[in-house]
């Protein structure tokens, strides 16, 4: 913290301009009026201050606005946003999408920081709902943000936002979220040809129903085991051995290493051992030859 000293004669800042980079920290503290700084924050973003000088400017704003900055200042914080603590940000009331975009731009290319997470939380709460414009903005900057939303919130995500999603952005999504995202992805990518479609849809397949997996098995997609292991168990169980073989292509050999894990384990239990043997992988646990398989779920539905 810079100690209070009187501003030297002739050094009082009349405006925020490049000459301020020649001020020492104590001179910035003494000679820059906080109210002037607040009204000319946009100019700070054009001046190559050092990080230490920016600390002084932040301190001046903190003193002027102990209850939290007004949006007119927040919108022009630029790099200073990264110097804010989540506690600082919780004092803000951010309602303009332009303000949100300006601050997200500063952090562009980096992981979502605690500051950004707090800002988004404040923004969404301030708006009262997660509207499409907000979602478009957030998914454009942070495709991984999708996985932090509830299935209810995800239902209003426009399919166009799905194009920005990278496979790693869905790593933290649970099956309930993928159930909502998969139909949107299917819609977003519907005009792509087979191989291109599969590349794009692959990371969303954790929400795919059985009929779509059956359809994919007819398209020589060669799904890798990592993708297969993320499929919904209830979607995999009805697949025949032939369909799984076609779905996985050369990767079918990987089933042996995963035979004790879901969904492979549960799928094996549903297949005839005769059929499993045709794969030549030594998979065990199928229904023994000569046994009758009753589909109890169908029986219950009829009664």
């Amino acid at each position: 913290e810079v100690e209070k000293t009187a501003c030297p004669s002739g050094k009082k800042a009349r405006e925020i301009d490049e000459s301020l980079i020649f001020y020492k920290k104590w001179e910035l503290e003494a000679c820059v009026d906080a109210a002037l700084l607040a009204t000319q924050m946009d100019r700070v973003n054009a001046i190559p201050f050092t990080y230490e000088q920016l600390d002084v400017l932040k301190h001046k704003l903190d003193e002027l606005y102990p209850q939290g900055y007004p949006e007119s200042v927040i919108q022009h914080l630029g790099y200073l946003f990264l110097k804010m603590s989540p506690e600082d940000i919780r004092k803000w009331n951010v309602t303009s999408l332009e303000t949100l975009k300006a601050l997200l731009e500063v952090n562009k290319g980096h992981e979502m920081s605690p500051q950004v997470a707090t800002l988004i939380d404040r923004f969404v709460k301030g708006r009262g709902q997660l509207d499409k414009d907000t979602l478009d903005t957030l998914t454009a900057f942070y495709p991984g943000y999708l996985c932090s939303l509830s299935p209810e919130e995800l239902s209003s995500v426009p399919p166009s936002s799905i194009w920005a999603v990278r496979p790693q952005d869905l790593d933290t999504c649970d099956p309930r979220q993928l159930d909502v995202l998969y139909p949107k992805a299917r819609l977003a990518f519907q005009n792509m040809n087979g191989s291109e479609y599969f590349v794009k849809i692959q990371s969303f397949l954790g929400g795919a129903p059985t009929e779509d997996l059956k359809a994919l098995s007819q398209q020589n997609v060669s799904m890798d085991l990592a993708t297969f292991m993320k499929l919904r168990t209830d979607a995999v169980l009805p697949l025949t051995v032939a369909e799984v073989q076609k779905l996985l292509g050369p990767h079918v050999e990987g089933l042996k290493a995963e035979e004790r894990h879901r969904p492979v384990r549960d799928w094996i239990l549903r297949q005839r051992q005769d059929d499993l043997d045709t794969l030549g992988l030594g998979l065990q646990g199928g229904i023994p030859n000569g046994y009758l398989v009753l589909d109890l779920s169908m029986q219950e539905a009829l009664s």
Epitope: I47, P48, L54, G78, Y79, K108
Partner: nanobody
Framework: LQLVESGGGLVQPGGSLRLSCAAS????????VGWFRQAPGTEREGVSS????????NYADSVKGRFTVSRDNAKHTVYLQMNSLKPEDTAVYYC??????????MGQGTSVTVS
């Protein structure tokens, strides 16, 4: 965002050096750049600045007439030409840059010794 300074060294009083500031991982062209220096045991101080277009330059009183800041956007580099160097110019010289949305970068410095 990272900046890399170079061109420092040992020079006799009255001599000249040209420092360079180049960007690593981004293009410097749209960034305003400032040169700063810090002598041992003192606070970092501003030396000069140049706008993104190169049309506006500023200097600290202590270096006016001796130092010239310029930029070559084709080479994505900003220069500080230092003439008539004095022992009191001895310091580590840093460049700092600011671009769109207030994105900032600062280098690790290059040492200049006038002796």
């Amino acid at each position: 965002l990272q900046l890399v300074e170079s061109g420092g060294g040992l020079v006799q009083p009255g001599g000249s050096l040209r420092l360079s500031c180049a960007a690593s991982g981004f293009t410097l062209d749209s960034y305003a750049v400032g040169w700063f220096r810090q002598a041992p045991g003192t606070e970092r101080e501003g030396v000069s600045s140049i706008s993104s277009s190169g049309g506006s330059t500023n200097y600290a009183d202590s270096v006016k007439g001796r130092f010239t800041v310029s930029r070559d956007n084709a080479k994505h580099t900003v220069y500080l030409q230092m003439n008539s160097l004095k022992p009191e110019d001895t310091a580590v010289y840093y460049c700092a840059a600011v671009g769109d949305y207030g994105r900032r970068a600062m280098g690790q410095g290059t040492s200049v010794t006038v002796s």
